[in-house]
Interface confidence: low
């Protein structure tokens, strides 16, 4: 990989746990200023594999609320608006980073955590297992 | 909201920037142990709105590598395996948290950042605008 020279203005790293424990500024910088203006908020309803969104709340986590997608049907919606069970609605999952308060209930001490969330659903051709 | 009593064993928060700056343990805890064993890695190919995955690398970001989905077609794949342009393949986007080194090139100082990533694609019915 590329070796980047260390910035001489970095904070002191005398912490005995360094480099496991780092300082993080929670003032979130949002890099999404140039996002596509096309509204994607209604894809959950217009998709051939539509989904509902469920609220997952955990006050010990940052962010404390995450919305999870759950596919509405096992099959996919066909051109007639009916569920076609020859196809499958499946969740698209992504691993995301969150901060977990550690020790619990501490306002300024966290641990990084990876969680798997379902972001939406897609329609796939099923894998058919033929019995010999 | 729920008020949770502060844990008396919390680290000291005398930092003048508190509560904006917090301590974070980078030893990632992975909560995905009970994930569904069904592999979703091939959905990108089996979907009626298939996608390709592109590598986005940034050594100043944690995680440094993020995979971005790009829909292969404007339309969706029909039962005959052809692209049907009466439907649209659209990206499902998710806002995720990442850590950005701040000041740059510092190993132990970060800022939280929100970025928008495309996780996969779904097939939607297009919005048709009728001209009067």
């Amino acid at each position: 990989g590329i070796t980047i020279p260390r910035n001489p203005g970095c904070p002191n790293s005398e912490d005995k746990n360094f480099p496991r424990t780092v300082m993080v500024n929670l003032n979130i910088h949002n890099r999404n200023t140039n996002t596509n203006p096309k509204r994607s908020s209604d894809y959950y309803n217009r998709s051939t594999s539509p989904w509902n969104l469920h609220r997952n709340e955990d006050p010990e986590r940052y962010p404390s609320v995450i919305w999870e997608a759950k596919c509405r049907h096992l099959g996919c919606i066909n051109a007639d608006g009916n569920v076609d069970y020859h196809m499958n609605s499946v969740p698209i999952q992504q691993e995301i980073l969150v901060l977990r308060r550690e020790p619990p209930h501490c306002p300024n001490s966290f641990r990084l955590e990876k969680i798997l969330v379902s972001v939406g659903c897609t329609c796939v051709t099923p894998i058919v297992h033929h019995v010999a | 909201g729920i008020t949770i009593p502060r844990n008396p064993g919390c680290p000291n928060s005398e930092d003048k920037n508190f509560p904006r700056t917090v301590m974070v343990n980078l030893n990632i805890h992975n909560r995905n142990t009970n994930t569904n064993p069904k592999r979703s890695s091939d959905y990108y190919n089996r979907s009626t709105s298939p996608w390709n995955l592109h590598r986005n690398e940034d050594p100043e970001r944690y995680p440094s590598v993020i995979w971005e989905a790009k829909c292969r077609h404007l339309g969706c794949i029909n039962a005959d395996g052809n692209v049907d342009y009466h439907m649209n393949s659209v990206p499902i986007q998710q806002e995720i948290l990442v850590l950005r080194r701040e000041p740059p090139h510092c190993p132990n100082s970060f800022r939280l950042e929100k970025i928008l990533v495309s996780v996969g694609c779904t097939c939607v019915t297009p919005i048709v605008h009728h001209v009067a």
Partner: nanobody
């Protein structure tokens, strides 16, 4: 810090009316589209209404068209939802939300206000 605080929910009889309010702070309210979103007990999330930055355009889900009206007062950093002709199926927690809605982190959402329609 972005804050969205809803109020105005409550118990109302079928056919009745309620006006929900959302007080916004921590961001430039007039720069964002705003939304009302609801979640019925045991159900998924449903987008109810959207209003553009200057209030010139409003959009509604079919089930509330002609009954609900979304409005905003940029001078007061406030969003409103006037609900008339309420039905049992309108029972839900109503959230106000900021900006482009993606089912993501909760930076964009309020804590919600419960609307119960029952005789």
């Amino acid at each position: 810090e972005v804050q969205l605080v809803e109020s105005g929910g409550g118990l109302v009889q079928p056919g009745g009316s309620l006006r929900l309010s959302c007080a916004a702070s921590g961001f430039t309210f007039s720069s964002y589209s705003m939304y009302w979103v609801r979640q019925a007990p045991g159900k998924g999330l449903e987008w109810v209404a959207e209003i553009k930055q200057d209030g010139s355009e409003q959009y509604y889900v079919d089930s509330v068209k002609g009954r609900f009206t979304i409005s905003r007062d940029n001078a007061k950093n406030s969003l409103y939802l006037q609900m008339n002709g309420l039905r049992a199926e309108d029972t839900a927690v109503y959230y106000c939300a900021k900006g482009e809605i993606l089912p993501l982190y909760f930076d964009y959402w309020g804590q919600g206000t419960l609307v119960t329609v029952s005789s």
